[in-house]
């Protein structure tokens, strides 16, 4: 049975050519975390984590993703484009698959809120 | 150049273990994960498992957990894989290959089990 | 495990023709997709990586497309060193799996 929770950073916003930090956490459960996914709203994967075999950057990032802080992701340089759904696939043992989710909306303005409060979605 | 050289064929009774080795040159060795690909029959591929030579993290298909073990030698740039309690279903080419999508692969060594 | 299925074991083509081969995932794989040509007696060789990305050195006949569940590998002009066997491969998540192959020969 699957216990855990995926608590993510939401939604957030943040300035054009800076950057953003994506993070999930995953709590309630004593399960194995084996490998974390980062995909676009595209389906279109950023980054893996395995816990063994370590970070691996997709090629179309790998100029402006940055692994970490943890199983988190930061992607920097941002653009208009990379507003939309970003999703982080949790890989468990025994439990199984979690997902969650994260909305970036990447604002023109000098005054972008960078807000970075947990939510569950 | 980027080169994966590995051992040379075996021929090993059943219930015995063998030692393949896959030793590379040509680029930084802690830059890239290390794999083992068994093909049957000259067909079917199995992932058998993979090797962070960074951190030393290894990570198994569950079928070959017991079957299969990697080891690592950091100062000669070579991967081993150790194959044990060998029957006829093991008989096989087993490969090496570097990378998450696997770039660069050994010429295969081809183990045949039989008494 | 994630299956891989390539439903066409045997592809008869004729030199010049366009081809695909589709691949079919039992879940979601994203585009951590590899396509790889083995021809007789030699190890396999990566074409595609990451569903759409070309190795180095490969010809630009050779394309990748695809994501989630449903990934193709096309040629759009087939050579006579194109016959070979075809396979796709994920790593969205270990144990990383194999498509049975798709063998390319001449009508």
């Known amino acids: 049975m699957m216990t855990g929770t995926i608590e993510t950073t939401g939604n957030i916003s943040a300035k054009k050519g800076g950057s953003v930090i994506l993070q999930c956490h995953l709590s309630s459960t004593m399960a194995q975390v084996t490998q974390v996914n980062w995909e676009q709203h595209d389906h279109s994967l950023l980054a893996i984590r395995n816990a063994e075999l370590g970070w691996h950057i997709y090629p179309a990032f790998k100029d402006r993703v940055a692994p970490g802080p943890g199983l988190g992701l930061t992607l920097q340089s941002l653009t208009m484009n990379d507003t939309g759904e970003y999703f982080c696939t949790y890989h468990t043992y025994p439990d199984g698959t979690y997902r969650g989710r994260i909305f970036l909306e990447v604002l023109e303005s000098s005054v972008a809120e960078h807000s970075a409060r947990f939510q569950i979605p | 150049e980027v080169q994966l050289q590995q051992s040379g064929p075996e021929l090993v009774k059943p219930g015995a273990s063998v030692k393949i080795s896959c030793k590379t040159s040509?680029?930084?060795?802690?830059?890239?994960?290390l794999h083992w690909v068994k093909q049957s029959h000259g067909k079917n591929l199995e992932w058998i498992g993979g090797f962070n030579p960074n951190n030393g993290g290894t990570n198994y298909n569950q079928k070959f957990k017991v079957k299969a073990s990697l080891t690592i030698d950091k100062s000669s740039n070579t991967v081993y894989m150790e194959l044990r309690s060998l029957s006829s279903e093991d008989s096989a080419v087993y490969y090496c290959a570097r990378n998450w999508a696997f770039d660069y692969w050994g010429q295969g060594t081809t183990l045949t089990v039989s008494s | 495990d994630i299956v891989m299925t390539q439903s066409h074991k045997i592809m008869s083509t004729s030199l010049g023709d366009r081809v695909n081969i589709t691949c079919k995932a039992s879940q979601h794989v994203s585009t951590a997709v590899a396509w790889y040509q083995q021809r007789p007696g030699q190890s396999p060789r990566l074409l595609i990586y990451s569903a759409s990305y070309r190795h180095t050195g490969v010809p630009d006949r050779f394309t990748g497309s695809g994501s989630g569940t449903d990934i193709t590998f096309t040629i759009s002009s087939v050579q006579t060193e194109d016959l070979a066997v075809y396979y796709c491969q994920q790593y969205y998540t270990t144990p990383w799996t194999f498509g049975g192959g798709t063998k390319l020969e001449i009508k």
């Open positions: 040509g680029y930084t060795f802690s830059d890239y994960t």
